[in-house]
Interface confidence: low
Protein backbone atom coordinates (compact mmCIF):
# COMPACT_ATOMS: atom_id res chain seq x y z
CA UNK A 1 0.00 0.00 0.00
CA UNK A 2 1.05 3.54 -0.70
CA UNK A 3 2.30 5.66 2.18
CA UNK A 4 2.52 9.47 2.35
CA UNK A 5 4.46 10.50 -0.72
CA UNK A 6 7.85 12.13 -0.50
CA UNK A 7 8.13 15.39 -2.44
CA UNK A 8 11.62 14.45 -3.63
CA UNK A 9 10.90 10.90 -4.82
CA UNK A 10 7.33 9.64 -4.70
CA UNK A 11 8.66 6.11 -5.16
CA UNK A 12 10.72 6.15 -1.96
CA UNK A 13 7.55 5.70 0.08
CA UNK A 14 6.26 2.65 -1.76
CA UNK A 15 6.50 -0.16 0.81
CA UNK A 16 7.55 -3.76 0.30
CA UNK A 17 4.85 -5.67 -1.55
CA UNK A 18 4.29 -2.83 -4.01
CA UNK A 19 6.08 -1.25 -6.94
CA UNK A 20 6.25 2.34 -8.09
CA UNK A 21 4.26 2.37 -11.31
CA UNK A 22 5.64 5.07 -13.62
CA UNK A 23 2.83 4.42 -16.06
CA UNK A 24 0.31 5.47 -13.44
CA UNK A 25 1.70 8.72 -12.12
CA UNK A 26 4.12 6.93 -9.78
CA UNK A 27 1.35 5.41 -7.69
CA UNK A 28 2.29 2.47 -5.45
CA UNK A 29 0.66 -0.54 -7.07
CA UNK A 30 0.48 -3.96 -5.39
CA UNK A 31 2.74 -6.66 -6.76
CA UNK A 32 0.79 -8.97 -9.06
CA UNK A 33 0.46 -12.62 -8.01
CA UNK A 34 3.63 -14.68 -8.37
CA UNK A 35 5.79 -11.60 -7.90
CA UNK A 36 7.22 -9.80 -4.88
CA UNK A 37 9.17 -6.80 -3.68
CA UNK A 38 11.10 -7.34 -0.49
CA UNK A 39 12.15 -3.72 -0.06
CA UNK A 40 10.44 -0.36 -0.45
CA UNK A 41 10.89 2.02 -3.34
CA UNK A 42 11.15 -0.63 -6.05
CA UNK A 43 10.21 0.23 -9.64
CA UNK A 44 9.23 -3.35 -10.43
CA UNK A 45 8.24 -6.50 -8.58
CA UNK A 46 10.48 -9.53 -9.03
CA UNK A 47 9.08 -12.79 -10.36
CA UNK A 48 8.79 -15.43 -7.66
CA UNK A 49 11.20 -18.33 -7.81
CA UNK A 50 9.46 -21.54 -8.85
CA UNK A 51 10.55 -24.75 -7.14
CA UNK A 52 10.15 -27.30 -9.92
CA UNK A 53 11.51 -30.74 -10.76
CA UNK A 54 14.06 -31.85 -8.21
CA UNK A 55 13.40 -28.67 -6.18
CA UNK A 56 10.46 -28.48 -3.80
CA UNK A 57 8.90 -25.50 -2.04
CA UNK A 58 10.14 -24.88 1.50
CA UNK A 59 8.49 -21.46 1.84
CA UNK A 60 5.77 -20.10 -0.44
CA UNK A 61 6.29 -16.81 -2.23
CA UNK A 62 4.43 -13.85 -0.73
CA UNK A 63 4.02 -10.29 -1.94
CA UNK A 64 7.04 -9.30 0.17
CA UNK A 65 9.33 -12.34 0.06
CA UNK A 66 10.57 -14.79 -2.54
CA UNK A 67 9.84 -18.50 -2.44
CA UNK A 68 12.52 -20.68 -0.88
CA UNK A 69 13.32 -24.12 -2.28
CA UNK A 70 14.91 -27.22 -0.92
CA UNK A 71 15.51 -30.58 -2.61
CA UNK A 72 13.30 -33.63 -2.98
CA UNK A 73 14.27 -36.72 -0.95
CA UNK A 74 17.41 -38.31 -2.30
CA UNK A 75 18.98 -34.94 -3.09
CA UNK A 76 20.57 -32.15 -1.05
CA UNK A 77 21.09 -28.42 -1.55
CA UNK A 78 24.24 -26.83 -2.92
CA UNK A 79 25.06 -23.16 -3.40
CA UNK A 80 23.61 -19.98 -1.96
CA UNK A 81 19.86 -20.22 -1.44
CA UNK A 82 19.85 -23.83 -2.63
CA UNK A 83 20.67 -22.91 -6.21
CA UNK A 84 21.40 -26.56 -7.09
CA UNK A 85 20.32 -30.00 -5.94
CA UNK A 86 22.92 -32.76 -5.85
CA UNK A 87 22.16 -36.46 -5.60
CA UNK A 88 22.61 -38.08 -2.18
CA UNK A 89 24.87 -41.13 -1.85
CA UNK A 90 24.94 -43.63 0.99
CA UNK A 91 27.28 -43.27 3.91
CA UNK A 92 30.54 -44.86 2.84
CA UNK A 93 30.22 -43.45 -0.68
CA UNK A 94 31.01 -40.30 -2.62
CA UNK A 95 29.45 -38.80 -5.73
CA UNK A 96 31.61 -38.99 -8.85
CA UNK A 97 30.87 -38.16 -12.48
CA UNK A 98 29.84 -41.78 -12.90
CA UNK A 99 27.51 -41.77 -9.87
CA UNK A 100 27.93 -42.96 -6.30
CA UNK A 101 31.11 -44.95 -5.65
CA UNK A 102 32.27 -46.68 -2.47
CA UNK A 103 35.05 -44.99 -0.52
CA UNK A 104 38.49 -46.43 -1.25
CA UNK A 105 40.24 -48.35 1.52
CA UNK A 106 41.69 -45.91 4.02
CA UNK A 107 38.96 -43.31 3.46
CA UNK A 108 35.48 -42.77 4.89
CA UNK A 109 32.34 -40.63 4.52
CA UNK A 110 29.85 -40.52 7.38
CA UNK A 111 27.35 -38.35 5.45
CA UNK A 112 25.12 -38.69 2.38
CA UNK A 113 26.98 -35.85 0.70
CA UNK A 114 30.57 -34.73 0.25
CA UNK A 115 33.71 -36.67 -0.51
CA UNK A 116 35.50 -39.56 1.16
CA UNK A 117 38.17 -38.33 3.60
CA UNK A 118 41.28 -40.20 4.78
CA UNK A 119 41.15 -41.93 8.14
CA UNK A 120 42.91 -40.09 10.92
CA UNK A 121 46.57 -41.08 11.25
CA UNK A 122 46.69 -41.86 14.97
CA UNK A 123 50.48 -42.25 14.98
CA UNK A 124 50.94 -38.59 14.03
CA UNK A 125 49.54 -37.74 17.45
CA UNK A 126 51.58 -40.43 19.11
CA UNK A 127 48.44 -42.50 19.63
CA UNK A 128 47.41 -45.98 18.59
CA UNK A 129 44.31 -47.23 16.76
CA UNK A 130 41.66 -48.20 19.29
CA UNK A 131 38.85 -48.93 16.80
CA UNK A 132 39.52 -49.64 13.14
CA UNK A 133 38.06 -47.37 10.50
CA UNK A 134 35.42 -48.39 7.97
CA UNK A 135 34.02 -46.83 4.80
CA UNK A 136 31.42 -45.09 6.99
CA UNK A 137 33.45 -44.24 10.10
CA UNK A 138 36.82 -42.76 10.95
CA UNK A 139 39.24 -44.70 13.13
CA UNK A 140 39.10 -44.08 16.87
CA UNK A 141 42.48 -43.21 18.33
CA UNK A 142 43.41 -44.42 21.78
CA UNK A 143 46.29 -43.80 24.17
CA UNK A 144 49.84 -44.28 22.90
CA UNK A 145 51.40 -47.72 23.55
CA UNK A 146 53.63 -46.20 26.25
CA UNK A 147 50.55 -45.04 28.17
CA UNK A 148 49.37 -48.65 28.41
CA UNK A 149 52.30 -49.73 30.65
CA UNK A 150 51.31 -51.56 33.89
CA UNK A 151 49.53 -49.27 36.33
CA UNK A 152 48.62 -46.67 33.73
CA UNK A 153 44.96 -45.98 33.11
CA UNK A 154 43.69 -46.38 29.57
CA UNK A 155 41.09 -43.68 30.18
CA UNK A 156 41.99 -40.07 29.43
CA UNK A 157 41.71 -38.05 32.69
CA UNK A 158 39.03 -35.35 32.76
CA UNK A 159 40.02 -31.75 32.13
CA UNK A 160 40.49 -29.65 35.28
CA UNK A 161 37.25 -28.19 36.56
CA UNK A 162 36.73 -24.46 35.92
CA UNK A 163 35.43 -22.07 38.51
CA UNK A 164 31.71 -21.32 38.01
CA UNK A 165 31.07 -18.15 36.09
CA UNK A 166 34.34 -18.17 34.23
CA UNK A 167 34.53 -18.94 30.54
CA UNK A 168 37.61 -20.43 28.91
CA UNK A 169 40.00 -17.81 27.55
Amino acid sequence: FERTRSLQDPCSNCPAGTFCDNNRNQICSPCPPNSFSSAGGQRTCDICRQCKGVFRTRKECSSTSNAECDCTPGFHCLGAGCSMCEQDCKQGQELTKKGCKDCCFGTFNDQKRGICRPWTNCSLDGKSVLVNGTKERDVVCGPSPADLSPGASSVTPPAPAREPGHSPQ
Epitope: F1, E2, R3, P15, A16, G17, R24, I27, C28, S29, P30, C31, P32, P33, S62, S63, T64, S65
Partner: antibody, heavy 116, light 107 residues
Framework: QVQLVQSGSELKKPGASVKVSCKAS????????MHWVRQAPGQGLEWMGW????????TYADDFKGRFVFSLDTSVSTAYLQISSLKAEDTAVYYC?????????WGQGTLVTVSS | DIQMTQSPSSLSASVGDRVTITCKAS??????VAWYQQKPGKVPKLLIY???IRHTGVPSRFSGSGSGTDFTLTISSLQPEDVATYYC?????????FGGGTKVEIK
Protein backbone atom coordinates in the same frame (compact mmCIF):
# COMPACT_ATOMS: atom_id res chain seq x y z
CA GLN B 1 -2.25 -23.42 9.66
CA VAL B 2 -2.57 -19.63 9.76
CA GLN B 3 -4.64 -18.37 12.69
CA LEU B 4 -5.40 -14.93 14.09
CA VAL B 5 -6.97 -15.04 17.54
CA GLN B 6 -8.42 -11.83 18.98
CA SER B 7 -9.22 -10.88 22.56
CA GLY B 8 -12.78 -11.13 23.89
CA SER B 9 -15.69 -8.70 23.81
CA GLU B 10 -15.45 -5.45 25.78
CA LEU B 11 -18.11 -3.26 27.36
CA LYS B 12 -16.83 0.25 28.07
CA LYS B 13 -18.17 3.59 29.19
CA PRO B 14 -17.80 6.72 27.04
CA GLY B 15 -14.41 8.35 27.60
CA ALA B 16 -12.71 5.11 28.58
CA SER B 17 -9.99 3.28 26.62
CA VAL B 18 -9.80 -0.24 25.25
CA LYS B 19 -6.97 -2.38 23.91
CA VAL B 20 -7.75 -5.22 21.50
CA SER B 21 -5.14 -7.91 20.83
CA CYS B 22 -4.62 -10.10 17.79
CA LYS B 23 -2.29 -13.08 18.23
CA ALA B 24 -0.93 -14.66 15.07
CA SER B 25 0.28 -18.22 14.61
CA UNK B 26 1.08 -20.62 11.78
CA UNK B 27 3.37 -18.24 9.87
CA UNK B 28 6.27 -15.84 10.37
CA UNK B 29 4.62 -12.80 11.95
CA UNK B 30 7.03 -10.21 10.53
CA UNK B 31 6.63 -11.44 6.93
CA UNK B 32 3.16 -9.92 6.49
CA UNK B 33 1.60 -6.59 7.41
CA MET B 34 -1.44 -6.52 9.72
CA HIS B 35 -4.55 -4.54 8.88
CA TRP B 36 -7.49 -3.44 11.02
CA VAL B 37 -11.09 -3.29 9.78
CA ARG B 38 -14.16 -1.96 11.59
CA GLN B 39 -17.73 -3.15 11.13
CA ALA B 40 -20.45 -1.18 12.91
CA PRO B 41 -23.68 -3.08 13.73
CA GLY B 42 -25.57 -3.86 10.50
CA GLN B 43 -23.02 -1.94 8.43
CA GLY B 44 -20.30 -2.76 5.90
CA LEU B 45 -16.55 -3.09 6.24
CA GLU B 46 -14.40 -0.03 6.89
CA TRP B 47 -10.60 -0.11 6.57
CA MET B 48 -8.90 1.55 9.54
CA GLY B 49 -5.25 1.20 8.55
CA TRP B 50 -2.30 -1.13 8.87
CA UNK B 51 0.95 -1.68 10.69
CA UNK B 52 4.24 -2.79 9.19
CA UNK B 53 5.11 -5.81 11.35
CA UNK B 54 8.81 -5.54 10.50
CA UNK B 55 9.32 -1.87 11.40
CA UNK B 56 6.28 -1.21 13.61
CA UNK B 57 5.32 1.77 11.46
CA UNK B 58 1.54 2.37 11.46
CA THR B 59 -0.56 3.94 8.70
CA TYR B 60 -4.03 5.24 9.58
CA ALA B 61 -7.04 5.98 7.40
CA ASP B 62 -8.16 9.61 7.70
CA ASP B 63 -11.17 8.75 9.89
CA PHE B 64 -8.97 6.88 12.35
CA LYS B 65 -6.23 9.40 13.03
CA GLY B 66 -5.94 10.59 16.61
CA ARG B 67 -7.71 8.26 19.03
CA PHE B 68 -6.63 5.00 17.41
CA VAL B 69 -3.18 3.45 17.90
CA PHE B 70 -1.74 0.31 16.32
CA SER B 71 1.17 -1.41 18.06
CA LEU B 72 3.03 -4.73 18.13
CA ASP B 73 4.79 -7.17 20.37
CA THR B 74 6.74 -9.25 17.87
CA SER B 75 8.14 -11.49 20.65
CA VAL B 76 4.64 -12.96 21.06
CA SER B 77 3.49 -12.39 17.43
CA THR B 78 0.73 -10.06 18.55
CA ALA B 79 -0.74 -6.87 17.11
CA TYR B 80 -2.75 -4.43 19.20
CA LEU B 81 -5.41 -1.81 18.56
CA GLN B 82 -5.92 0.78 21.28
CA ILE B 83 -8.85 3.21 21.19
CA SER B 84 -8.95 6.09 23.65
CA SER B 85 -11.74 8.54 24.57
CA LEU B 86 -14.35 6.02 23.46
CA LYS B 87 -17.61 7.30 21.96
CA ALA B 88 -20.93 5.54 21.40
CA GLU B 89 -20.23 5.53 17.64
CA ASP B 90 -17.11 3.38 18.25
CA THR B 91 -19.44 0.47 19.04
CA ALA B 92 -18.48 -2.11 16.42
CA VAL B 93 -16.72 -5.36 15.71
CA TYR B 94 -13.01 -4.79 15.12
CA TYR B 95 -11.13 -7.27 12.95
CA CYS B 96 -7.42 -7.79 12.40
CA UNK B 97 -6.45 -9.25 9.03
CA UNK B 98 -3.16 -10.46 7.62
CA UNK B 99 -2.27 -8.91 4.27
CA UNK B 100 -0.56 -10.75 1.46
CA UNK B 101 -2.01 -10.11 -2.01
CA UNK B 102 -5.23 -9.24 -0.18
CA UNK B 103 -6.56 -9.63 3.38
CA UNK B 104 -6.21 -13.38 3.24
CA UNK B 105 -6.74 -14.39 6.89
CA TRP B 106 -8.92 -12.63 9.47
CA GLY B 107 -9.28 -12.75 13.21
CA GLN B 108 -12.65 -13.77 14.67
CA GLY B 109 -13.43 -10.15 15.55
CA THR B 110 -13.72 -8.31 18.86
CA LEU B 111 -17.01 -6.61 19.74
CA VAL B 112 -16.45 -3.32 21.53
CA THR B 113 -19.63 -1.86 23.03
CA VAL B 114 -19.57 1.71 24.30
CA SER B 115 -22.51 2.52 26.51
CA SER B 116 -23.19 4.58 29.60
CA ASP C 1 -10.46 8.15 -2.22
CA ILE C 2 -11.56 5.60 -4.80
CA GLN C 3 -15.25 4.72 -4.53
CA MET C 4 -16.38 1.14 -5.13
CA THR C 5 -20.05 0.89 -6.08
CA GLN C 6 -21.61 -2.55 -5.80
CA SER C 7 -24.85 -3.65 -7.40
CA PRO C 8 -27.33 -4.92 -6.62
CA SER C 9 -27.36 -4.18 -2.90
CA SER C 10 -29.37 -7.37 -2.38
CA LEU C 11 -30.71 -10.22 -4.45
CA SER C 12 -32.75 -13.37 -4.04
CA ALA C 13 -32.14 -16.41 -6.24
CA SER C 14 -32.95 -20.11 -6.33
CA VAL C 15 -30.54 -22.93 -5.58
CA GLY C 16 -28.66 -23.76 -8.78
CA ASP C 17 -29.09 -20.27 -10.28
CA ARG C 18 -26.19 -18.34 -11.77
CA VAL C 19 -25.63 -15.21 -9.69
CA THR C 20 -23.67 -12.16 -10.83
CA ILE C 21 -22.56 -9.27 -8.62
CA THR C 22 -20.89 -6.21 -10.13
CA CYS C 23 -18.53 -3.64 -8.70
CA LYS C 24 -17.60 -0.36 -10.36
CA ALA C 25 -14.55 1.66 -9.33
CA SER C 26 -14.58 5.46 -9.57
CA UNK C 27 -11.19 5.32 -11.33
CA UNK C 28 -8.90 2.76 -12.93
CA UNK C 29 -7.67 0.24 -10.34
CA UNK C 30 -5.93 -2.13 -12.77
CA UNK C 31 -6.72 -5.68 -11.58
CA UNK C 32 -6.16 -4.90 -7.90
CA VAL C 33 -9.61 -5.99 -6.70
CA ALA C 34 -10.49 -8.61 -4.10
CA TRP C 35 -13.83 -10.17 -3.20
CA TYR C 36 -14.84 -11.27 0.30
CA GLN C 37 -17.71 -13.37 1.60
CA GLN C 38 -19.26 -12.72 5.00
CA LYS C 39 -21.85 -15.20 6.23
CA PRO C 40 -24.36 -13.97 8.84
CA GLY C 41 -22.63 -13.49 12.19
CA LYS C 42 -19.32 -14.73 10.83
CA VAL C 43 -15.89 -13.39 9.85
CA PRO C 44 -15.21 -12.11 6.30
CA LYS C 45 -13.34 -14.61 4.13
CA LEU C 46 -11.22 -13.91 1.09
CA LEU C 47 -12.69 -15.46 -2.06
CA ILE C 48 -10.91 -13.82 -5.00
CA TYR C 49 -7.83 -11.63 -5.32
CA UNK C 50 -6.20 -9.87 -8.25
CA UNK C 51 -9.69 -9.77 -9.83
CA UNK C 52 -9.81 -13.41 -10.87
CA ILE C 53 -7.59 -15.66 -8.71
CA ARG C 54 -9.41 -17.93 -6.27
CA HIS C 55 -7.99 -18.07 -2.76
CA THR C 56 -6.97 -21.44 -1.32
CA GLY C 57 -9.94 -23.72 -0.67
CA VAL C 58 -12.53 -21.56 -2.45
CA PRO C 59 -14.99 -23.70 -4.48
CA SER C 60 -14.69 -23.48 -8.27
CA ARG C 61 -18.27 -22.19 -8.61
CA PHE C 62 -16.92 -18.78 -7.53
CA SER C 63 -15.16 -16.82 -10.24
CA GLY C 64 -14.06 -13.23 -10.71
CA SER C 65 -13.39 -11.14 -13.79
CA GLY C 66 -12.73 -7.59 -14.92
CA SER C 67 -10.03 -4.94 -14.98
CA GLY C 68 -9.83 -1.17 -15.01
CA THR C 69 -13.11 0.02 -13.48
CA ASP C 70 -15.60 -2.84 -13.98
CA PHE C 71 -15.49 -6.08 -12.01
CA THR C 72 -17.76 -9.08 -11.60
CA LEU C 73 -18.14 -11.89 -9.08
CA THR C 74 -20.07 -14.88 -10.41
CA ILE C 75 -21.50 -17.86 -8.53
CA SER C 76 -22.13 -20.39 -11.29
CA SER C 77 -24.60 -22.52 -9.32
CA LEU C 78 -25.93 -21.00 -6.09
CA GLN C 79 -25.82 -23.29 -3.05
CA PRO C 80 -27.62 -22.85 0.30
CA GLU C 81 -24.26 -22.28 2.03
CA ASP C 82 -23.59 -19.28 -0.24
CA VAL C 83 -26.12 -17.15 1.66
CA ALA C 84 -23.93 -14.22 2.71
CA THR C 85 -22.98 -10.62 2.05
CA TYR C 86 -20.29 -10.19 -0.60
CA TYR C 87 -17.90 -7.24 -0.62
CA CYS C 88 -15.52 -6.04 -3.30
CA UNK C 89 -12.41 -4.10 -2.33
CA UNK C 90 -9.90 -2.14 -4.36
CA UNK C 91 -6.37 -2.46 -3.08
CA UNK C 92 -4.78 -0.38 -5.81
CA UNK C 93 -3.92 2.50 -3.54
CA UNK C 94 -4.41 3.79 0.00
CA UNK C 95 -6.96 3.80 1.46
CA UNK C 96 -8.15 0.44 0.18
CA UNK C 97 -11.90 0.88 -0.07
CA PHE C 98 -14.72 -1.63 0.17
CA GLY C 99 -17.95 -1.67 -1.77
CA GLY C 100 -21.16 -1.38 0.21
CA GLY C 101 -21.88 -5.10 0.00
CA THR C 102 -24.38 -7.33 -1.80
CA LYS C 103 -26.66 -9.49 0.33
CA VAL C 104 -27.45 -12.82 -1.36
CA GLU C 105 -30.47 -14.82 -0.18
CA ILE C 106 -32.19 -18.02 -1.32
CA LYS C 107 -35.73 -17.78 -2.73
Amino acid sequence: QVQLVQSGSELKKPGASVKVSCKASGYTFTDYSMHWVRQAPGQGLEWMGWINTETGEPTYADDFKGRFVFSLDTSVSTAYLQISSLKAEDTAVYYCARYDYAMDYWGQGTLVTVSS
Amino acid sequence: DIQMTQSPSSLSASVGDRVTITCKASQDVSSAVAWYQQKPGKVPKLLIYWASIRHTGVPSRFSGSGSGTDFTLTISSLQPEDVATYYCQQRYTTPPTFGGGTKVEIK
